[in-house]
Every structure is written in C-alpha cells, then in structure tokens.
C-alpha cells in the first residue's frame, strides 16, 4: 500500500495505491483510491507511466480526455466512471502486454487540493492448475496442468501423509512454449503415488503462486484449486 | 449492512433554531461525504449541504449558509444538521445522505416550524 | 445553479408497460445523473448513478441514459412495487440539484 500526499497543509489530498500483477492478454486493474469530492466537475483523475512520455490516461471534468494519451495505450484504458464521485480512481487495463510493467503515478486533483501516489505494476502469465489421476501410466501418477504461465515458475509437490518429504525425484517438469511464443503450458507428472492420501501441486513465479489439491481414496476423488498473487502491497 | 438512523421529530417556534442528529453504522464513516437534504410538504429534494469527516471538509449551498451549520463527532460516527432562524416554509423532512452518490439516505426527520 | 427539469410531472401506466421520464439539464453535466426511487413516507433510494450504472441490488427493468443536458430514465416492465415518485439530480457542480419529480401510478 502506498500513501501518497500533496504538497502543502490544507492543499493535499491522501491518494493510496495498490501495487498489483496483470495477466497478459487478460484484462488488468490498476487500483488508486483518493479522498472524494461531492462534485464531479473539480475532479482530474491523471494516470502517468515511468519513461512514457503520453499520458496513460485522463479523466477530468467528469469526462475522459484522452487527446495526450500515449500510443501504447490508446483503446485500452477506462476508469470506472460512476466511482469517482465516490474516490476511485482505479484504471481498467485492456489486454495487458508483457511491456505494461513499470511505475505507475496516480495523479489527483480535486476541489480541495492535489495528491499523487505511484503504484508498481508487474506483468506476467498465471492460471489455475488441475490435478488429475493419470489412468495412462503404468503405476500410480498424478499429473498436474497449467495452461499459462510467465516467467518460467517452480513447481513443487507435497503431500498430507509425508509432510517434509523431497519429490523431485519422483517428479518430472516440463515447460512447453504455447503459440504466442511468450507463455508457457506447465505440465508436471508425479509417480508412485498411493492411495488415501492429498497431494498438492504448487506452481510459483515472481508474480503469483497457484496451488492444485487432490484427494485420492478408494471410493473418490477431491481436487481444489487456490491462486493468490504475491506482491499486491498498498501505498 | 449500512444504516443512518436519525433523531425523532421536533416541533419549533419561528426564530429557533433546531438541530438534527444522523448516527452512522456499517461503513467507515471519516470516509465519506454526509449530505443534507430536505423535502418541504409537495417540494423537490433540496441539497443543503455536505460534510468530509475526515477533514471536516464542508460545502453548503449559498441558499442556507449563514443559517445551517454541518458538524461531525467522529468519535461517535454522527452527523449533526442545525439550521437557525427557523421560519415557517422550514417545515420540511430532513434526511442525511451518505456520499456523493447518495448511496443510503436515513429515515427522515420531520421538523415543524409553527407559532 | 443547475437547473434540472423533470418531464412528465405524473404518470399512469399499465403493469408491463415501458415507462420513460426524461430530465433537462440547464447546462452541460457530462454524465453526472443520478435517479432515486421515492416511496410514500419513506426515504428516497439510489437506483442509477452517473447516467446508466444501476446500483447494487437494482432491477434490470431500470435504465438510464444520456449526455450533456438531455437525460432518459427507463422502466422496461413496469411492476406494481414500482408505484412511486423518481426524481433526477445532477452531481456534476454544487449545488446539487434534484429533478421536481414524477410520481409513477398503475391505471
């Protein structure tokens, strides 16, 4: 969380930022918060991007004005227009690309003053993984898919009954580049598996850590999913 | 869940002056914007003014200022409305407001305004 | 002041009827349009923020829409419970200002 002022006593506004991660090619939010007017025509909402020149985006006099918007994000940004008035000045990010990464400066003006915060924004590829038995291999094995991630994550398996114990060799990752060349499909199989017991596959990067839970008795099977993004701190 | 619970009905002699009560709950309430609003008997809704607790940011409508006065006790999560000077077209339900949106409005208070 | 004016002043329309008010802004306001539903006796509620967000909870049969001066509110069926008054209001400059009102009836 960062906590950003304006300059000077009465004259500052509090503006708070979110860092956050965005999946690329799926849509992003970049999260700013300010002190609310009770009027929408003294709000300027500016959205600023390290080493772009352009704005990313502009909102002011209860409009977007887009006329120095930046190339790079021309038809991909949009605030949320009924949540001004009420001190959000979170930005939609469309298709998010590998180069929206950067520092971002959340820029406020309002009736009773200024306020900016900046705000880092990381960019990669992460999805859910599923666990399933595989009925196609010799023995007992798990096998553990990802359709997309960026960078290439680690991939660790754990289970409930050996808590502590080292799988790695009993293991077998591989990383195979999908069509745009950028993400990649996660594909880890685990062997010698037995039954009545959970096995947790963890999937994790610099952006986001997902995890893919299976149950496997005699009777059943149980699978969960859980994905949690690491650096969403505020400022 | 949100709630603005008002204080019950007064009745005023003209020249008095009366002060309105608005309890916040559910909400952060430094937080937000609380508005004033009347409605006299057959009359449109009339903005009076607005109140930033966390500032004590305050914004009337020149039609009431010099007679409404906005305050907060933060400490209590209350807003308060007085409007001094009453005369007769005063008569009117007054209602608080949260935020800018007028998102949740409490109950209403009648004030009657009569010799 | 902005002033806000709200045709018709009342209704009355069939259950299932599409109902449409429309509001006019003396000047420019963007999209800073409010619609609250008043019932008799009680406090108004938020139905669409600027111009054609329904707020939390609100039927889809209520719309809204417009720019500028010239704003719409819709109800696409209406329903007995929507027996009431609407009124209009502008948050784009202070002082907010509200609509005179339409009260809905059913024939």
């Known amino acids: 969380l960062i906590i950003g002022f304006g300059i000077s006593g009465r004259h500052s506004i509090t503006v708070t930022t979110v860092a956050s991660a965005g999946n690329i090619g799926e849509d992003g939010i970049l999260s700013c918060t300010f002190e609310p007017d009770i009027k929408l025509s003294d709000i300027v909402i500016q959205w600023l991007k390290e080493g772009v020149l352009g704005l990313v985006h502009e909102f002011k006099e209860g409009k977007d004005e887009l006329s120095e918007q930046d190339e790079m994000f021309r038809g991909r940004t949009a605030v949320f227009a009924d949540q001004v008035i009420v001190g959000n000045a979170s930005l939609r990010l469309k298709n998010v690309q590998l180069t929206d990464a950067g520092t971002y400066k959340c820029y406020i003006i309002t009736s009773k003053g200024k306020g900016n915060a900046n705000l880092e924004y990381k960019t990669g590829a992460f999805s859910m993984p599923e666990v399933n038995v595989d009925y196609n291999a010799s023995s007992e094995t798990l096998r553990c898919e990802a359709p997309r991630w960026f960078p290439q994550p680690t991939v660790v398996w754990a289970s409930q009954v050996d808590q502590g114990a080292n799988f790695s060799e009993v293991s077998n990752t591989s990383f195979e580049l999908n069509s745009e060349n950028v993400t990649m499909k996660v594909v880890s199989v685990l062997y010698n598996v037995t039954i009545n017991n959970t096995y947790s596959c963890m999937i994790e990067n610099d952006i986001a850590k997902a995890t893919g839970d299976i149950k496997v008795t005699e009777s059943e099977i149980k699978r969960r999913s859980h994905l949690q993004l690491l650096n969403s701190k505020a400022s | 869940e949100v709630q603005l619970v008002q204080s019950g009905a007064e009745v005023k002699k003209p020249g008095a002056s009366v002060k309105v009560s608005c309890k916040a709950s559910?909400?952060?309430?430094?937080?937000?914007?609380m508005n004033w609003v009347r409605q006299a008997p057959g009359q449109r809704l009339e903005w009076m003014g607005g109140?930033?607790?966390?500032?004590?940011?305050?914004e009337y409508n020149e039609k009431f200022k010099g007679r409404v006065t906005l305050t907060v006790d933060t400490s209590a999560s209350t807003a308060y409305m007085e409007l001094s000077s009453l005369r007769s077209e005063d008569t009117a339900v007054y209602y608080c407001a949260r935020d800018s949106r007028f998102s949740y409005w409490g109950q209403g208070t009648l004030v009657t305004v009569s010799s | 002041d902005i002033q806000m004016t709200q045709s018709p002043s009342s209704l009355s329309a069939s259950v299932g009827d599409r109902v449409t008010i429309t509001c006019k802004a003396s000047?420019?306001?963007?999209?800073?349009v409010a619609w609250y539903q008043q019932k008799p006796g009680k406090a108004p509620k938020l139905l669409i923020s600027?111009?054609?967000y329904r707020y939390t909870g609100v039927p889809s049969r209520f719309s809204g829409s417009g720019s500028g001066t010239d704003f719409t509110f819709t109800i696409s069926s209406l329903q007995p419970e929507d027996i009431a008054t609407y009124y209009c209001q502008q948050h784009y400059s202070t002082p907010l200002t509200f609509g005179g009102g339409t009260k809905v009836e059913i024939k």
């Open positions: 559910g909400y952060t309430f430094t937080s937000s914007w």
């Open positions: 000047q420019d306001v963007r999209t800073a």
């Open positions: 600027s111009t054609s």
């Open positions: 109140i930033y607790p966390n500032r004590g940011n305050i």
